[in-house]
Each structure stands twice: as structure tokens, then as C-alpha cells.
């Protein structure tokens, strides 16, 4: 008799793929023209990335450092109207993209939480949660919670409101902290909170260190659902050496949890790479005309248009990974086991019951390395075969679908491999 199938875990929508942050509507859409109506026209692009949720804003009225002139219920007219927002929600729903609204109050000011008037701001946030939940948003994000006095109890209250409305709603909190103890204490009081932090960016970017960061995080957070990013708001290029961008995309998409990206991460957008670019919100490079002020400043391979036409581009890799992440059971909710491999490498396996299994091998080093996979520290349920098929490599030159002998596996500098192999009873 065939072995019984393992019962599937309850899956919320944010478990099924990546979240995509658009913190600055105008920068995302291009020079000075960004509003909610225009964003509606970019939903097809987001669909092509197979992201499950859009983390949007803040969009509310906020006069820098002035509580009285901050209204979490009013959309800043520069971004559009409430009607535009409602239309965006409807269009996003039709494309199965969830919308998460950033309600960080003083987003234009110094202290994002108006440190002197925390209680009145917290009441405003409570009211705003109820208002926007009724408007149809799928969740909320609040950032810089390390600057919010008594953050844990406020977050617990806000999560109660959010989950009280529907278990299908999500609360995301962001912190600049990279301290694991601080992160865990924030998570402890909130069972379903998704927390983005700078934890992974406080790294020496070696295989060994990354492996220890990931395993420590997973051990400390127990069996709760995690999110993976390098910061609460910034671009990957602001935290990573350029040569590791592809490697990190592969890792973020294949770790157990929800990957969270910022607009432009999929094309390797750089903060302030071009003259006059604001550091915090660089203009999205849709095509070569995205920077009309400086002819020739943007080459095709930096843009969405150029990378869409190149199967070897970062954008193509992102799309491939996002597609795998959203449809393969082992990547959606599979078990995770790391195991020993050569120095400079980080290797792990994802598996779920009798479904196809995935092996991820990441070479963080500057030199080519033999994988040296040692499966002895894997449990019996996750043993390695002698061969696995290549799903993708972060570097050109390998043939997708080709079987690779794991004992002889060699990786190029900064190469990451995603391999698949079947369950064998």
C-alpha cells in the first residue's frame, strides 16, 4: 500500500509567494507622474512577476512632524483620491494581487511615530485600521517600530483589530534592528505578525555566516512563519555586493517563509546610481526614456524593457524563481534542512511529503568551488540522491533540465543552483 499523504498545512495568501513594496508611488512610475490611477496600469507588470501582494505607500496626508496635519484616513491628493484607491483595489483583486497599505504615520518627518504624542497617534492608527479594512485592504504595514514606545502592546492591539476583521488579513511591522533578541521579543507578543528587519544585512556575506544567520533565526522563531528581506524598506543593491544579487534572489525565494522585495529589486535598481537620483527612492527604470534629463544615462540592460527581452537577465531570473516559489509544494511549505558542504557554501534542501524535492547550493565565494555535499547530517526523510536535475543557475552557461551528479558538483564564483529530484519511497 502507498504511504498516506501528509496533511497540508493551512496556507494564508502571503504564504504563497513574494510581497512587492512600492514605498514611493512617484519614483515607481517615473518622473513626477506617479499616482494611483497610473499604478493601476502597472498591475499587469506585477502579475508578470507573480507577486502575491503589493505593499503600498504610505499614501495618507502627512505634514512633516505635525500630528494635527496628519490624517491617516485621507489620501494625499498628490497620489489621487479615495475613488482612485478603491478602483486600484478592485483591479488588483481581479488580478489576484492583494494590497497592503503602509500606515506609518509621520513618513515625511523625522520621527516616524511623533515620539511626543504616541498615545494619540496610536488611537489614530486604530481608527485607520478599521476604516481601511472596511475599504477592502488586505493588510497593513507599519515601519520603524523600534521608535514606537511600547511597540509590542500596540502591535498586539493592532493585530487583534486586523485579525478580528478577518484571519485573512495581514499585519507587517518593519524595524531597522538587526538584533535577534529584539526581533524575537517583538514577534513573541504577536502570533501572526510578519516582521521585516535588517537582520540578514548584518552579515559578512560568506556562506558560513549566512547559514548561521538563517539557522539561528529559524531556531529562535520556532515554527512560526517568517519573512525574508534585507531591510524594512530599502533596495537589495543598498545592502549587497553586486555580485551576490542573483544569489540572494535565489536564497530569498527558497527559504521557508515569505520573500519581501522593494520595487526595482527585480532589475537590480541602484539607489542614487544616476545623477540627481534621490537615494531613498530612485526612479524605476522602465525603459531608456526613464531618465530624459540625461541622454544615454540609462542603457537597455538596466531597464525592465531590456531585461524582459533577455532570458539571462536578473528580471528573468526573478520571474522564474517567483513562478517556482508559487507553485511547488516543497517551496511553498516544505521542511527545511541545511547540511554540510564546502567552505564558502550554504546548502539546504526543501521537501514536502511525496512531492518533488529541491536542493539549493549557494557559493558566496569569489572562487569556483567543489560543492562537497555531505548528506550525513540530513534526516532519513530528506536524503540526497546521486543525481538531481538543474532547475536554474544564477549564472549563464548551464543547460536547464540537465541532470547533475551531486558528488562531482562544482560551482562558479557567486553561483547559486536550484536543483530538483523526485521523492523515492
Amino acid at each position: 500500500r502507498a504511504p498516506r499523504c501528509r496533511e497540508l498545512p493551512a496556507q494564508k495568501w502571503w504564504h504563497t509567494g513574494a510581497l512587492y513594496r512600492i514605498g514611493d508611488l512617484q519614483a515607481f512610475q517615473g518622473h513626477g507622474s506617479g499616482n494611483l490611477a497610473g499604478l493601476k496600469g502597472r498591475l499587469d507588470y506585477l502579475s508578470s512577476l507573480k507577486v502575491k501582494g503589493l505593499v503600498l505607500g504610505p499614501l495618507h496626508k502627512n505634514q512633516k512632524d505635525d500630528v494635527a496635519q496628519t490624517d491617516l484616513l485621507q489620501i494625499d491628493p498628490n497620489f489621487g483620491s479615495k475613488e482612485d484607491f478603491d478602483n486600484l483595489l478592485q483591479s488588483a483583486k481581479k488580478k489576484s494581487i492583494r494590497v497592503i497599505l503602509d500606515l506609518t504615520p509621520n513618513y515625511r518627518g523625522e520621527n516616524l511615530w511623533f515620539s511626543t504624542q504616541v498615545d494619540s497617534v496610536a488611537t489614530k492608527v486604530k481608527d485607520a485600521l478599521e476604516f481601511w479594512l472596511q475599504a477592502g485592504v488586505d493588510g497593513f504595514q507599519v515601519r520603524d517600530i523600534e521608535n514606537l514606545k511600547d511597540a509590542s502592546s500596540f502591535l498586539a492591539e493592532w493585530e487583534n483589530i486586523t485579525k478580528g476583521f478577518s484571519e485573512d488579513r495581514l499585519l507587517i511591522a518593519g524595524t531597522n534592528s538587526s538584533d535577534l533578541q529584539q526581533i524575537v521579543s517583538l514577534l513573541e507578543s504577536n502570533k501572526d505578525l510578519l516582521l521585516t528587519s535588517s537582520y540578514l544585512s548584518d552579515s559578512s556575506f560568506t556562506g558560513e555566516h549566512t547559514k548561521s544567520l538563517v539557522t539561528q533565526y529559524l531556531n529562535a522563531t520556532g515554527n512560526r512563519w517568517c519573512s525574508w528581506s534585507l531591510s524594512q524598506a530599502g533596495l537589495l543593491t543598498s545592502f549587497l555586493p553586486a555580485q551576490l544579487l542573483r544569489l540572494y534572489q535565489l536564497m530569498l525565494f527558497t527559504l521557508p517563509g515569505t520573500p519581501v522585495f522593494s520595487y526595482g529589486d527585480e532589475i537590480g535598481l541602484k539607489a542614487a546610481a544616476l545623477p540627481g537620483q534621490p537615494v531613498e527612492a530612485p526612479v524605476m527604470l522602465w525603459d531608456e526614456s526613464s531618465f530624459p534629463d540625461i541622454p544615454g544615462a540609462v542603457s537597455a540592460n538596466m531597464t525592465v524593457k531590456g531585461q524582459s527581452e533577455d532570458p539571462g537577465s536578473l528580471l528573468s531570473l526573478f520571474r522564474q524563481l517567483s513562478d517556482q516559489r508559487s507553485k511547488e509544494r516543497s517551496l511553498l511549505h516544505g521542511d527545511f534542512h541545511t547540511f554540510s558542504s564546502g567552505p564558502g557554501l550554504f546548502s539546504y534542501i526543501r521537501h514536502w511529503d511525496q512531492n518533488e524535492r529541491f536542493l539549493v547550493v549557494l557559493n558566496f565565494g569569489d572562487v569556483g568551488l567543489s560543492a562537497g555535499l555531505q548528506a550525513s547530517d540530513l534526516p532519513a526523510s530528506a536524503s540526497l540522491p546521486t543525481k538531481a536535475d538543474l532547475v536554474l543557475s544564477t549564472q549563464p552557461g548551464r543547460e536547464e533540465g540537465s541532470p547533475l551528479e551531486l558528488e562531482r558538483l562544482k560551482l562558479e564564483p557567486h553561483e547559486g543552483l536550484l536543483l530538483r529530484f523526485p521523492y523515492v519511497a
Epitope: D71, L72, L73, S120, T123, K124, K126, D127, A128, E130, F131, Q134, A135
Partner: nanobody, 125 residues
Framework: QVQLVESGGGLVQAGGSLRLSCAAS????????MGWFRQAPGKEREFVAT????????YYADSVKGRFTISRDNAKNTVYLQMNSLKPEDTAVYFC??????????????????WGQGTQVTVSS
């Protein structure tokens, strides 16, 4: 149960002012989001303004923004609608409504479980 009784309506010249009141009895008033809606003859009921249970947050329809002010006095179990610079198109029956599930009411009338009988406001030109 919540009972709501509106008052303060009447006939007023364009440019004039009125203050509507809505007295609530029954369930704890201070935990309800409260709203005002209106219905002109031959038209659907439309949202005017809403206020959170503490009175901290308010939201208005674009058509009344800057002219109408919603407020509440939880000690008196009453919500108010101050209407200034009235226009003929503000002519309608004005209804007060209570949302017992949310501290912050919304713009759609289905969220409100309890309604008053309405008070007529007529603005002549």
C-alpha cells in the same frame, strides 16, 4: 439595541447654517462608530460623514468637506453635524447611524446596524 433620534433640521437660506443632533440610547455609545447619511428625493442614500468612537478621527464625503463638521459628546451620548455654507443641493433627509461592530465607521451604509428616523433639511435659493 440602540435607539437614535435626530433633531435640528429645518428650512434655511442658501449660505446659512444648521446644527443637527443625534441622541443615542441603549448600548454603550462610546464604543460605536457613528455616521451621518442623507437621502434627497428620488435619489439613493449617500454618505456624509463619520466619526470614530473616541472622536479622534473623522472622514467626510468630498461634497461636504470644509463645510460640514461631525463631532460627538460621549458624556451626552450625542453626535452632531454642524452644516455651514449650505447649498440647495444639500436638501435631503439626514439620517444618523451607529456601527456597533467598529469603532471607526465607514462610508458604506451596510456597516451601520442602527438608524434614526431622519430629519428634513431644506435649503432654499
Amino acid at each position: 439595541q440602540v435607539q437614535l433620534v435626530e433633531s435640528g433640521g429645518g428650512l434655511v437660506q442658501a449660505g446659512g447654517s444648521l446644527r443637527l443632533s443625534c441622541a443615542a440610547s441603549g448600548r454603550a455609545f462610546s464604543s460605536n462608530g457613528m455616521g451621518w447619511f442623507r437621502q434627497a428625493p428620488g435619489k439613493e442614500r449617500e454618505f456624509v460623514a463619520t466619526i470614530s468612537c473616541s472622536g479622534t478621527s473623522t472622514y467626510y464625503a468630498d461634497s461636504v468637506k470644509g463645510r460640514f463638521t461631525i463631532s460627538r459628546d460621549n458624556a451626552k451620548n450625542t453626535v452632531y453635524l454642524q452644516m455651514n455654507s449650505l447649498k440647495p443641493e444639500d436638501t435631503a433627509v439626514y439620517f444618523c447611524a451607529a456601527d456597533t461592530r467598529h469603532c471607526m465607521g465607514y462610508t458604506k451604509d451596510e456597516g451601520y446596524a442602527y438608524w434614526g428616523q431622519g430629519t428634513q433639511v431644506t435649503v432654499s435659493s
